[in-house]
Amino acid sequence: AVNGTSQFTCFYNSRANISCVWSQDGALQDTSCQVHAWPDRRRWNQTCELLPVSQASWACNLILGAPDSQKLTTVDIVTLRVLCREGVRWRVMAIQDFKPFENLRLMAPISLQVVHVETHRCNISWEISQASHYFERHLEFEARTLSPGHTWEEAPLLTLKQKQEWICLETLTPDTQYEFQVRVKPLQGEFTTWSPWSQPLAFRTKPAALGKDT
């Protein structure tokens, strides 16, 4: 392993998964590295092998149990180390005392569906996946709608500052194809970040009735 600029970032999905990304400038692609997890108040230790995701970036998932099991709490601390093989020994390349509920990134929302669609509006609902019951209602959402001829990056963000798993999109154009995405973030945690965007939901508004004003 080389002493280039490094970055080690991990997130807890609030249930039973810690996902980590390790990057290092100038590191060799075939370097053998792993993440080792050592909790302060649990009987398990966990290791996952870092697998290449790009030229100088590796990732792995520490799977702590069944997807919906609550494996860590707000008082847990898990010491995470990146260990890379150097000859016959392992070298500590990065270390952190990981506080799961300070470093949250939930799974992308799922089960998006059109509840009701009209000419100018559409009501959409979704569900959150593998989210801890600890959050109660302390979640927020961002949503975006892809209009014809635009990119996702150009789509304005709609913010829902509460746990509201539906939205009514208005001022839509009749008989037009749209796509919709949503993401979620807990309010808790200094280093918490947004979930990935959901899979896009495609929908089409109803055509305007003939002879009516649009």
Epitope: R91, A94, I95, K99
Partner: nanobody, 126 residues
């Protein structure tokens, strides 16, 4: 704003001990890795030791290993450096430094430091 205030330096004879303290404020101390660095007269800044945010991991420069001990009290927002068997070569201004996250990188311990204090002078001389 982030504030780091070192204390505990002074004049000590070779073989003696000192305990440095660093009082931290302006950020959630328990969420960040910390370190001690030092600068001897006319020399570059030198890394001494680092500690993880909850104190479960520590690393030391070879020059101080076995003599210095880094620790922290997250309830008191204070970082410590216990220095034993002091040598004249340990004479320097000692700075407490904050990392930009909970992570530090032992092979490149200078990486990611974003704040340091004003320092406290340690002089080892007979």
């Amino acid at each position: 704003q982030v504030q780091l205030v070192e204390s505990g330096g002074g004049l000590v004879q070779p073989g003696g001990s000192l305990r440095l303290s660093c009082a931290a404020s302006g950020f959630t101390f328990s969420n960040y890795a910390m370190s001690w660095v030092r600068q001897a007269p006319g020399k570059e800044l030198e890394w001494v030791s680092s500690i993880t945010s909850a104190g479960r991991g520590t690393h030391y420069a070879d020059t101080v290993k076995g003599r210095f001990t880094i620790s922290r009290d997250n309830d008191e927002n204070t970082l410590y450096l216990q220095m034993n068997s002091l040598e004249p070569e340990d004479t320097a201004v000692y700075y407490c430094a904050k990392y930009s996250s909970a992570t530090y990188y032992p092979p490149t311990p200078a990486q990611g430091r974003d704040y340091r204090g004003q320092g406290t002078q340690v002089t080892v001389s007979s």
